[in-house]
């Protein structure tokens, strides 16, 4: 006869491990008992359980309520046992010793491998700002047994580097993603992908990139010269910029206070019916937490009654 078993039994943490040991013998042979032992390089061989054909399953107190026979129907030649709720400390070598009649004793050893699936965590790097050099965008750490694989999935151009730390029963892997921040990266997803034999599918954690920037400011509204004549209504100046975080706008007049009746509404400066009093240099000040920009324009309101004056519109930033 011979024993049918496995060299390696692999189970995920918390699952039940079936330790197989089946005696394949002649029809007239019988199994008297199957003794299971844990083989420890330091502590030697320690009995785990004994499965006796007459006296039933005996379990070592250290494994009480954790070792069982597989559910019926059971073959009398099957000495397999179930180790409930596998933990990392269960990982190691096991031995089954089968006492048969009349063939004698047979033994086999197997290794129990307990997979510990990782629980990854993603940590964003310092705030990203346009104009910085190569900067840490995010790091992703996963610890498991065996060591997990940590990679990045993104359309963003960057570099990734990994390092691992080995512990007695697991390994922690940290991968960092570095990039040169630009405004085009704003809102782009950066996904950490963790692979491991204990996971049915990859674990993914997505971080949305935020890159702080502030665009140059410019003013629109002076394109149509006919709008800037005495008596005209609805004249506006609009300050154009964009940024992250979204910028705030402030309007001032360089050569004095804003004329009465001029209304500031965010990025837009609205004028009442125009008079020559509205002529002057107007400054749009754009700012966010990162930076500030200015753009100024010179407005000259033409009086159609004064043919000596031409409309002179000058814009400068």
């Amino acid at each position: 006869g011979e024993l049918e078993t496995s060299d390696v039994v692999t189970v995920v943490l918390g699952q039940d491990a079936k330790l197989p040991c089946f005696y394949r013998g002649d029809p007239d042979e019988q199994v008297g008992q199957v003794a299971w032992a844990r083989v420890d390089p330091n502590e030697g061989i320690r009995e785990l359980a004994l499965l006796h054909s007459k006296y039933g399953l005996h379990v070592n107190p250290a494994y009480e309520d954790r070792v069982e026979q597989p559910p019926p129907p059971r073959d009398p030649l099957d000495g397999s046992v179930l180790l409930r709720n596998a933990v990392q400390a269960d990982e190691g070598e096991y031995e089954c010793r089968v006492s048969t009649f009349p063939a004698g004793s047979f033994q086999a050893r197997m290794r129990l491998r307990v997979l510990v699936p990782p629980l990854p965590s993603l940590n964003p790097g310092p705030p990203l700002e346009e104009g910085q050099g190569l900067t840490l965008a995010a790091s992703c750490t996963a610890e498991g047994s065996p060591a997990p694989s940590v990679t990045w999935d993104t359309e963003v151009k960057g570099t990734q580097s990994s390092r691992s730390f080995t512990h007695p029963r697991s390994a922690a892997v940290t991968s960092e993603f570095h990039l040169v921040p630009s405004r085009s990266m704003n809102g782009q997803p950066l996904t950490c992908v963790v692979s491991h034999p204990g996971l049915l599918q990859d674990r993914r954690i997505t971080h949305t990139l935020q890159v702080a920037f502030l665009a140059e400011a410019s003013v629109r509204g002076l394109e149509d010269q006919n709008l800037w004549q005495v008596g005209r209504e609805g004249a506006t100046l609009k300050c154009l910029s964009e940024g992250q975080p979204p910028p705030k706008y402030n309007w001032t007049r360089l050569d004095g206070p804003l004329p009465s009746g001029v209304r500031v509404k965010g990025d837009t400066l609205g004028f009442p019916p125009l008079t020559t009093e509205h002529s002057g240099v107007y400054v749009c000040h754009v700012s966010n937490e990162l930076s500030s920009r200015d753009s100024q324009v010179t407005v000259e309101v033409l009086d159609p009654e004064d043919p000596g004056k031409q409309v002179d519109l000058v814009s400068a930033s």
Partner: nanobody, 117 residues
């Protein structure tokens, strides 16, 4: 041959306790399986508890949480601690020892346990 001598039986009220001892004439460390069967009047003999040379144990479902089996290798003795005894535990308790796997077990002479309500 292994001689087994039991002691510790007696009459006890329900809820009480007894400790049975089974002294073997040779090292219990070398005995494959030792333990206790019981037989109540008019009933079949049933396995109550067992302990292996490697220290693994078995208790019948009917006594789990109430009985414990242990052994003292130095004294070549196996013990059955019986707590929270019930009238249905009344029986003759027999110590057994299977010296080598597959061999017929050796038996003690039996000790009477009576639990009164």
């Amino acid at each position: 041959e292994v001689q087994l001598v039991e002691s510790g039986g007696g009459l006890v009220q329900a809820g009480g306790f007894l400790r049975l001892s089974c002294a073997a004439s040779r090292s219990v460390f070398r005995i494959n399986v030792m333990g206790w069967y019981r037989q109540a009047p008019g009933k079949q003999r049933e396995l109550v508890a067992g302990i292996t040379s490697g220290g693994s144990r078995r208790l019948a479902d009917s006594v789990k949480g109430r009985f414990t089996i242990s052994r003292d290798n130095a004294k070549n003795t196996v013990y059955l601690q019986m707590n929270s005894l019930k009238p249905e535990d009344t029986a003759v308790y027999y110590c057994f020892a299977e010296a080598v796997v597959g061999d017929e077990p050796y038996w003690g002479q039996g000790t009477q346990v009576t639990v009164s309500s």
